[in-house]
Every structure is written in structure tokens, then in C-alpha cells.
Interface confidence: medium
């Protein structure tokens, strides 16, 4: 921050440390980054709002992350650009403190959201049987609220009230920084809490996720070729469920039966997010079942999400029972990390030849699943998840490390780092908010399609885009 007095004048003339063309360049680059950050994060938020297929627990975390990143794109980036190009803080001490509080609270909330996502993925992989049951919208909301409240408690009071605690404001009018940062040791302490600790935790968690994925790939390789099918025959269920009034499976149907199939834990409990599109859609399987069902003589097919219903034995009686063949992942809307093995159930029918037809359908489905896989086997999905996880971790480390390394150096050598380097380092932390939508959302097919619809103003059927 290069401020100087004008020699011809007694008043302090604060001048920009940059030449005109440099100012234009900085404003253009910073403005573009701010715009991309705003658009990217708004797209994530709107996509989740308008597309019901994106309204999963995992994406609620992304929504919170996008909120934090959007605030950074709107306020933090632009005010810091103004501060950088002018060379001093022109908006007074109150706005300065409010900006700093917002900046640090939101940046910390962004990091905490990344931590939540990391823990969520970790538990999805390491506790596939118990965690999904606890993983409700309410629990997600509580975790998100905790991230924001904790960030606020950590930063806002200290930033806003430090001057009153020590009894004097030592920050000059044209300057804007956190007053307690005058102490390099305090700065380093906050860097540990805000960066080094989260990085260590995230690295350890992702290492565990990666290890769990690799061990599953090895297991898959050892298993017989039959198990390489998208739907392993040993995991296909054909069971009779007592019908209820809604012609839907009764209360025992839900998450529980999906936990252990044929006496063993599901084979492929992949975390959702970046393979959500592929996992949840099971489009090939749905089509195959439709074909099986339509080959039967008197059928009526209704397709909704992952369910193919086949009404058998038409009856004039409104209350006549139907057979429903349900295929695909059996996960409630809120959940997105439960095992992804396809299950097939045959829901009871008391119509003519009902049992017979159920058996035929069930047999045909089992037969269908034994056919060679057209899709890539699960290991490729595992690799994809691990790769995405690595990308996310690297994006965070690459963007946040330079500034925090400078803070570390600064503890031992104050004048070693030029102002320009500080500015670039500080900006890189902001750029993490630009990268996040790409890292977390663009690797998801449903997100990508929804983005495309939104950008091209194709609002028709956007709520059901898969």
C-alpha cells in the first residue's frame, strides 16, 4: 500500500501504486474473476433450487458452499480490488471492519463447508451401513448452520470489537486490516486454525476415502467375472412384499433392506456427488426392465424416476392389487451416499395368474442382469470419485497455500515479501471460490445439463432434468 504526500500540497494525496494500464488490467482481470464467481455460484444455487433431482443432502452442502462463494464474489473480491488499485482504503473504518468481518467469516465458512463435504464423503465410504440412516436433511441443515455460526463466532467479534477490547484503534483511516494482525504470532495462529488444520484433516480424510476405494477395486478384481456386471445377480432381489393400500411396498421397505443383501455388505458404496448422475439414473437398467415388462401380454407401464411399474391382470375393481417392479437404487431423496447396487422387488399381486407372472418377470430380470455389461465396471467409477476428490483437495491447497506460506515466512522475516506478492496470494484465496463450482458441480452430469438449460433459457422440464 504505497501512500505518499504531494510535495506541492500540505494535504495527504493518496496515490495508486499502479500505472494507468496496470490499473485497467487489474480491474479487467479481477472484474472477470468476480463475474465468473458470481455466475458459477448462482448457477449452482439455482440448479439445486429448480431441479428436484439435485435436491440431495450432498447438494445442500454444495448450496451452502455456493452461498459463501457467492458472497466472496460479490463483496470481497470487488472491495479488495478497489483497495488494491487505489492504494488505500477509501470507505472509512466502519465499512472496513464490516468488510473484513464478512470476508473472514465467509472465507472460513467456505473452508468449513469443504470440511463438512469431506467428512460426509468419508463417512459415506467408511460407514455405509450406519451413516446413511443418520444422514437426513435436518442433520445436514444443522451441520451447515454449525459451519456458519462457528465461523461467525471465530472471526466477527474479534474483528469488530478488538479496538474496544484494547481501548484504541491503531488502524489508520486509509488502512484496512485486522487490528490484532499487527502481531505476527497471532496471524500465524489464525493461519493454523483457518488453513493448516483444515488441510491436514481434509488430506487425512481423502487419503482414507482413496484407500477405501482402492481396496474395493482390488476386491472387485478378485471376484468372479459375473460380479463385474452393473447389476450383480447375487444382489438382485425378487421378493414378495405384502401390498398396502397405495399398492406400494409396506413400511419395512426402505433403507434397511438395502444394507445387507444375501448376507454380505453391499459391494460398491460409492460416495455420490461426482458420479451421482451415473449412479442414480441407472437408465440402461430401467430401459431393460421396460422391455421385459412390455413383452408381457397385458401390461401398462408407468415410469417414474427409478421405478418401472407393471400393472398385471386388469380388473374393473379399483382396489385390485398390482405388481410393481422396482429397480434402481433404493435411496430416499435426501440421501445420496447409500449403496448403489440395483435391487429388484416384485410387489404382490392378487390378480389372475399374478404369482406366475411375477415369477416370469423376476426370472427375466435375473436373466437380464447376467448379460455382459455394456457400462464400465464399478472400478472406473471408484477411480473417478477418487480423482475428483484429489482435484478438490488440490484446488483448495493450491489456492490457499501461497498466502498461508507467506504468513508463515512473515513470522520470521517481515519485509521479505513484496506487496504485489501479498496481493496475489490474497487473491488466490478468493479464486478458490471461483474454482469450487467447477470442482463440485461440473463433474456431475445432472448439474451440467441443468446449467446448460439455465444458460440457454430452456426452462421447460428443467425441474426433472437428469
Amino acid at each position: 500500500m504505497n501512500n505518499s504526500t504531494n510535495s506541492s500540497n500540505n494535504s495527504l494525496a493518496l496515490t495508486s501504486p499502479y500505472k494507468t494500464f496496470e490499473v485497467v488490467f487489474i480491474v479487467l482481470v479481477a472484474g472477470s474473476l468476480s463475474l465468473v464467481t458470481i455466475i458459477g455460484n448462482i448457477l449452482v444455487m439455482v440448479s439445486i433450487k429448480v431441479n428436484r433431482h439435485l435436491q440431495t443432502v450432498n447438494n445442500y452442502f454444495l448450496f451452502s458452499l455456493a452461498c459463501a462463494d457467492l458472497i466472496i464474489g460479490v463483496f470481497s473480491m470487488n472491495l479488495y480490488t478497489l483497495y488494491t488499485v487505489i492504494g488505500y482504503w477509501p470507505l472509512g473504518p466502519v465499512v472496513c471492519d464490516l468488510w473484513l468481518a464478512l470476508d473472514y467469516v465467509v472465507s472460513n465458512a467456505s473452508v468449513m463447508n469443504l470440511l463438512i463435504i469431506s467428512f460426509d464423503r468419508y463417512f459415506c465410504v467408511t460407514k455405509p451401513l450406519t451413516y446413511p440412516v443418520k444422514r437426513t436433511t435436518k442433520m445436514a441443515g444443522m451441520m451447515i448452520a454449525a459451519a456458519w455460526v462457528l465461523s461467525f463466532i471465530l472471526w466477527a467479534p474479534a474483528i469488530l470489537f478488538w479496538q474496544f477490547i484494547v481501548g484504541v484503534r491503531t488502524v489508520e483511516d486509509g488502512e484496512c486490516y485486522i487490528q490484532f494482525f499487527s502481531n505476527a504470532a497471532v496471524t500465524f495462529g489464525t493461519a493454523i486454525a483457518a488453513f493448516y488444520l483444515p488441510v491436514i484433516i481434509m488430506t487425512v480424510l481423502y487419503w482414507h476415502i482413496s484407500r477405501a476405494s482402492k481396496s474395493r477395486i482390488k476386491k472387485d478384481k478378485k471376484e468372479p467375472v459375473a460380479n463385474q456386471d452393473p447389476v450383480s445377480p447375487s444382489l438382485v432381489q425378487g421378493r414378495i412384499v405384502k401390498p398396502n393400500n397405495n399398492n406400494m411396498p409396506s413400511s419395512d421397505d426402505g433403507l434397511e433392506h438395502n444394507k445387507i443383501q444375501n448376507g454380505k455388505a453391499p459391494r460398491d458404496p460409492v460416495t455420490e456427488n461426482c458420479v451421482q448422475g451415473e449412479e442414480k439414473e441407472s437408465s440402461n437398467d430401467s430401459t431393460s426392465v421396460s422391455a421385459v415388462a412390455s413383452n408381457m401380454r397385458d401390461d401398462e407401464i408407468t415410469q417414474d424416476e427409478n421405478t418401472v411399474s407393471t400393472s398385471l391382470g386388469h380388473s374393473k375393481d379399483e382396489n385390485s392389487k398390482q405388481t410393481c417392479i422396482r429397480i434402481g437404487t433404493k435411496t430416499p431423496k435426501s440421501d445420496s451416499c447409500t449403496p448403489t447396487n440395483t435391487t429388484v422387488e416384485v410387489v404382490g399381486s392378487s390378480g389372475q395368474n399374478g404369482d406366475e407372472k411375477q415369477n416370469i418377470v423376476a426370472r427375466k430380470i435375473v436373466k437380464m442382469t447376467k448379460q455382459p455389461a455394456k457400462k464400465k465396471p464399478p472400478p472406473s467409477r471408484e477411480k473417478k470419485v477418487t480423482r475428483t476428490i484429489l482435484a478438490i483437495l488440490l484446488a483448495f491447497i493450491i489456492t490457499w497455500a501461497p498466502y498461508n506460506v507467506m504468513v508463515l515466512i512473515n513470522t520470521f522475516c517481515a519485509p521479505c515479501i513484496p506487496n504485489t506478492v501479498w496481493t496475489i496470494g490474497y487473491w488466490l484465496c478468493y479464486i478458490n471460490s471461483t474454482i469450487n463450482p467447477a470442482c463440485y458441480a461440473l463433474c456431475n452430469a445432472t448439474f451440467k445439463k441443468t446449467f446448460k438449460h439455465l444458460l440457454m433459457c430452456h426452462y421447460k422440464n428443467i425441474g426433472a432434468t437428469r
Epitope: 501512500n3 505518499s4 494482525f181 490474497y426
Partner: nanobody
Framework: QVQLQESGGGAVQAGDSLRLSCAAS????????MGWFRQAPGKEREFVAS????????QYADSVKGRFTISRDDAKNTVYLQMNNLKPEDTAVYYC??????????????WGQGTQVTVSS
Amino acid sequence: QVQLQESGGGAVQAGDSLRLSCAASARSFVSYAMGWFRQAPGKEREFVASISWSGTMTQYADSVKGRFTISRDDAKNTVYLQMNNLKPEDTAVYYCNAVKYIPGRGEYDYWGQGTQVTVSS
């Protein structure tokens, strides 16, 4: 903002002494490292002397070592440059400089308007 006002300059003979003062209107004078620079006609501005914010460390240009002494009085928000055994080559405009180094933000750099020192032989 921090305003710096130099005083004490003037015209002297070679071998004489002068004491320059720089008064700072700063909220936190104690957190600033203070320095003196000079600029002779037709030449670049050059470093003369500096004193750390705590007053424990001082630095001097080789050309003034042993002749000039920098000191500070935090109670008065003032920094001094005691110049002894002045030489004609010391003729220049002397500028006061205040630098506050903030971890995570970089330097805040302020300059005074300068005071003229003329040494004749």
C-alpha cells in the same frame, strides 16, 4: 491517514551540525518503522537512515555512518536525524518515511514533503 511533517532544515557551513525532526500524526506511531531519505538535484532518491518500530534496530547508508544518528520519541510521535560534520555532498531535500508492515497485508508506506538542507564549503 498518516501525515509526516519535516522540520529543522536550513543552510549551514561544512563541518556544522543540524537536527532534523519529523512529526507524525499517526494513531499508532509505535507500530511504524521510521526512516530518512534524501534527493540531491538531478539524482535518485537515496536511503539515509532508518529505525525499527521498537527503536532497537538502526541502519545507515555507508556515506553517513559515524556522522548521522537516527532516534525516535514515541511519546511525541517524532523521529530525529542528528547530522554532525556535514559535507557539501550532503546537500539535498531530506524526506521522512514511515513504514508499517502488517502481516497478511504488506507495507503501508507514507512520505513527508521534505525539508531542504544546503551545506556550503
